[in-house]
């Protein structure tokens, strides 16, 4: 799997999108997990609603939310109040039974300032010899969520 870099700004919210084939993954719940070390397990952070038909409902675990557009085939994860220690390698997963298919590998990068990232033209895309193959960098520098957009109280 290729790895996509999503760059966010400390203190703000970051939206990560994971596109998938809606027919292939029809009826499957999704999850967002954090990789523990290079070869370690992927620790579940949050998963979509237990009832697949309600996957569009946003579910929260702490400052992380997940919602699934099952028709359009896009899983969206929101990391609220992003902090440097949130940086790391994550995965979007499609669940079936006790198994999980990786939809996308995501490297979350937390920048100190929205002006600190390079322009897309300056970004380096590593070749196949590098550990992250055919990397794609998403400048998901986004504003903080407005108060009214945050479900209160957050449900997990």
């Amino acid at each position: 799997h290729n790895t996509t870099v999503f760059q966010g700004v400390a203190g703000q919210s970051l939206q990560v999108s994971c596109p998938y084939d809606s027919m292939k993954h029809w009826g499957r719940r999704k999850a967002w997990c954090r990789q523990l070390g290079e070869k370690g397990p992927c620790q579940r952070v949050v998963s979509t609603h237990n009832l697949w038909l309600l996957s569009f409902l946003r579910r929260w675990n702490g400052s992380t939310a997940i919602t699934d557009d099952t028709l359009g085939g896009t899983l969206t994860i929101t990391l609220r109040n992003l902090q440097p220690h949130d940086a790391g390698l994550y995965q979007c997963q499609s669940l079936h039974g006790s198994e999980a298919d990786t939809l996308r590998k995501v490297l979350v990068e937390v920048l100190a300032d929205p002006l600190d990232h390079r322009d897309a033209g300056d970004l380096w895309f590593p070749g196949e010899s590098e550990s992250f193959e055919d990397a794609h960098v998403e400048h998901s520098i986004s504003r903080s969520l407005l108060e009214g957009e945050i479900p209160f109280p957050p449900t997990s």
Epitope: V5, Q7, A10, G11, Q35, G37, Q83, P84, H85, D86, A87, G88, L89, L107, E109, V110, L111, A112, D116, H117, R118, D122, L123, W124, P126, E130, S131, F132, A135, V137
Partner: antibody, heavy 120, light 107 residues
Framework: EVQLQQSGPVLVKPGASVKMSCKAS????????MNWVKQSHGKSLEWIGT????????SYNQKFKGKATLTVDKSSSTAYMELNSLTSEASAVYYC?????????????WGQGTSVTVSS | DIVMTQSHKFMSTSVGDRVSITCKAS??????VAWYQQKPGQSPKLLIY???TRHTGVPDRFTGSGSGTDFTLTISNVQSEDLAEYFC?????????FGGGTKLEIK
Amino acid sequence: EVQLQQSGPVLVKPGASVKMSCKASGYKFTDYYMNWVKQSHGKSLEWIGTINPYSGGISYNQKFKGKATLTVDKSSSTAYMELNSLTSEASAVYYCTRRNWDGRYAMDYWGQGTSVTVSS
Amino acid sequence: DIVMTQSHKFMSTSVGDRVSITCKASQDVSTAVAWYQQKPGQSPKLLIYWASTRHTGVPDRFTGSGSGTDFTLTISNVQSEDLAEYFCQQYSSYPFTFGGGTKLEIK
């Protein structure tokens, strides 16, 4: 064995600029952030900034923004820091340090330091 | 900026003793705290990260604890080679900041 080999000591005049290097070996350069830390004589440590050689992402300590510029050359696994408009306050030892992409980790390897003396 | 305060600039101990070095953050930093050891004339070395995880190769007499705002580095069975300055650092939020350091003196 992980090694961060830094360039030698420099003596510069006030107002001048200096560019120091940090050559990494013993690991995959693009898999780790490179940080720079300042240690003034007999004092504590100050984080200057970090650069991700993989994505090009850079974060600076606001205190050093406009004063320090971080770059990398992936082909030679070398990180650089340029300091401009130097004053006596910039006299210090500067360390490059490696940090895992995972935000739960700290700066696990340090270079031997580059001593900068600003004097007329 | 988060201020990391190491209240003791110097601490004196004897070989074989147990010593605790403390560090206080000006606001909650969760467990995003590291401890470094710097021996005279050398670069700092990582001892502990994520408040309590020992870095590879660090002797188990070094133990880190704490979360939120109060953190402790404990050295049990102090050895003469532990003569050094110890710094705490938070990496919970930008800019990353260090404590002022605690110099450990061996009696």
